[in-house]
């Protein structure tokens, strides 16, 4: 099993590379990986005590 691409920049991650639509670039492992969709809910109505927390749509299993 080959090691990760560490020779050029050591443990620094390279700039993100284009990934297919269902994927995104993971700086930690330096590869395109499966990604879910990030979303920010609409703000609560005026007078609500705190802003809605940011959440995400789960990745397809």
């Amino acid at each position: 099993m080959r090691r990760g691409p560490r020779s050029l920049r050591g443990r620094d991650a390279p700039a993100p590379t284009p990934c297919v639509p269902a994927e995104c670039f993971d700086l930690l492992v330096r590869h395109c990986v499966a990604c879910g969709l990030l979303r920010t809910p609409r703000p609560k109505p005026a007078g609500a005590s705190s802003p809605a927390p940011r959440t995400a749509l789960q990745p397809q299993e």
Epitope: G4, F25, D26, L28, V29, L37, L38
Partner: antibody, heavy 125, light 107 residues
Framework: EVQLVESGGGLVQPGGSLRLSCAAS????????IHWVRQAPGKGLEWVAW????????DYADSVKGRFTISADTSKNTAYLQMNSLRAEDTAVYYC??????????????????WGQGTLVTVSS | DIQMTQSPSSLSASVGDRVTITCRAS??????VAWYQQKPGKAPKLLIY???FLYSGVPSRFSGSGSGTDFTLTISSLQPEDFATYYC?????????FGQGTKVEIK
């Protein structure tokens, strides 16, 4: 249901070997990275190794480099941690975990969302 | 390697209190920080990822903020089930590193 189940822990003498398994269900380990994290008794969390099964890429903590090997069998949906030349300081509960990613401007925003129950490795004579 | 320094290492609080835990990275990690909760004998649970995003199913009393080197986990109103140890973790550069933990105890 997503689940990770570790096995293979136990008591081993210094210098000995163990192979831990992490059987995944409810998702494919090919889709992301799998990590091993350990916790010595009464101590904090220490990352040990990761693997991206699709690419075969791996990395290790300096404390285990050259002694531990992480691998994966995608047909069995299982990751492994082969531990050789074990030392007393390797005594810990070993967890495997899945890293989840969400797309934030093309880059992963994520964390370790599913963890196994842990398996205890005791290195003692 | 990037060091993650949490403070305080422990704190005592009462139900209903607002609790803040901080984490400082030894170098810029952008927003690549996650927060976990761990109870004795159990595996950690993901609370917050990417510094401020609440993981699915986590109560909204938990929130995270920060960018660069300074990060905060806040529990707006501490509940009995929140007494646990909390860890920050950076995932900007391998190796991913954890803070030493903050134990939240009952006052």
């Amino acid at each position: 249901e997503v689940q990770l189940v570790e096995s293979g822990g136990g008591l081993v003498q210094p210098g000995g070997s163990l192979r831990l398994s992490c059987a995944a269900s409810g998702f494919s380990i090919s889709s992301n990275s799998i990590h091993w994290v350990r916790q010595a008794p009464g101590k904090g969390l220490e990352w040990v190794a990761w693997i991206t099964p699709t690419h075969g890429s791996t990395d290790y903590a300096d404390s285990v480099k050259g002694r531990f090997t992480i691998s994966a069998d995608t047909s069995k949906n299982t990751a492994y941690l082969q531990m050789n030349s074990l030392r007393a300081e390797d005594t810990a509960v070993y967890y495997c975990a899945r890293r989840v990613c969400y797309n934030r401007l093309g880059v992963c925003a994520g964390g370790m969302d599913y963890w196994g129950q842990g398996t205890l490795v005791t290195v003692s004579s | 390697d990037i060091q993650m320094t949490q403070s305080p290492s422990s704190l005592s609080a009462s139900v209903g209190d607002r609790v803040t835990i901080t984490c400082r990275a030894s170098q810029d990690v952008s927003t690549a920080v996650a927060w976990y909760q761990q109870k004795p004998g159990k595996a950690p649970k993901l609370l917050i990822y990417s510094a401020s995003f609440l993981y699915s199913g986590v109560p909204s009393r938990f929130s995270g903020s920060g960018s660069g080197t300074d990060f905060t986990l806040t529990i707006s109103s501490l509940q009995p089930e929140d007494f646990a140890t909390y860890y920050c973790q950076q995932s900007r550069i391998t190796p991913p590193t954890f803070g030493q933990g903050t134990k939240v105890e009952i006052k």
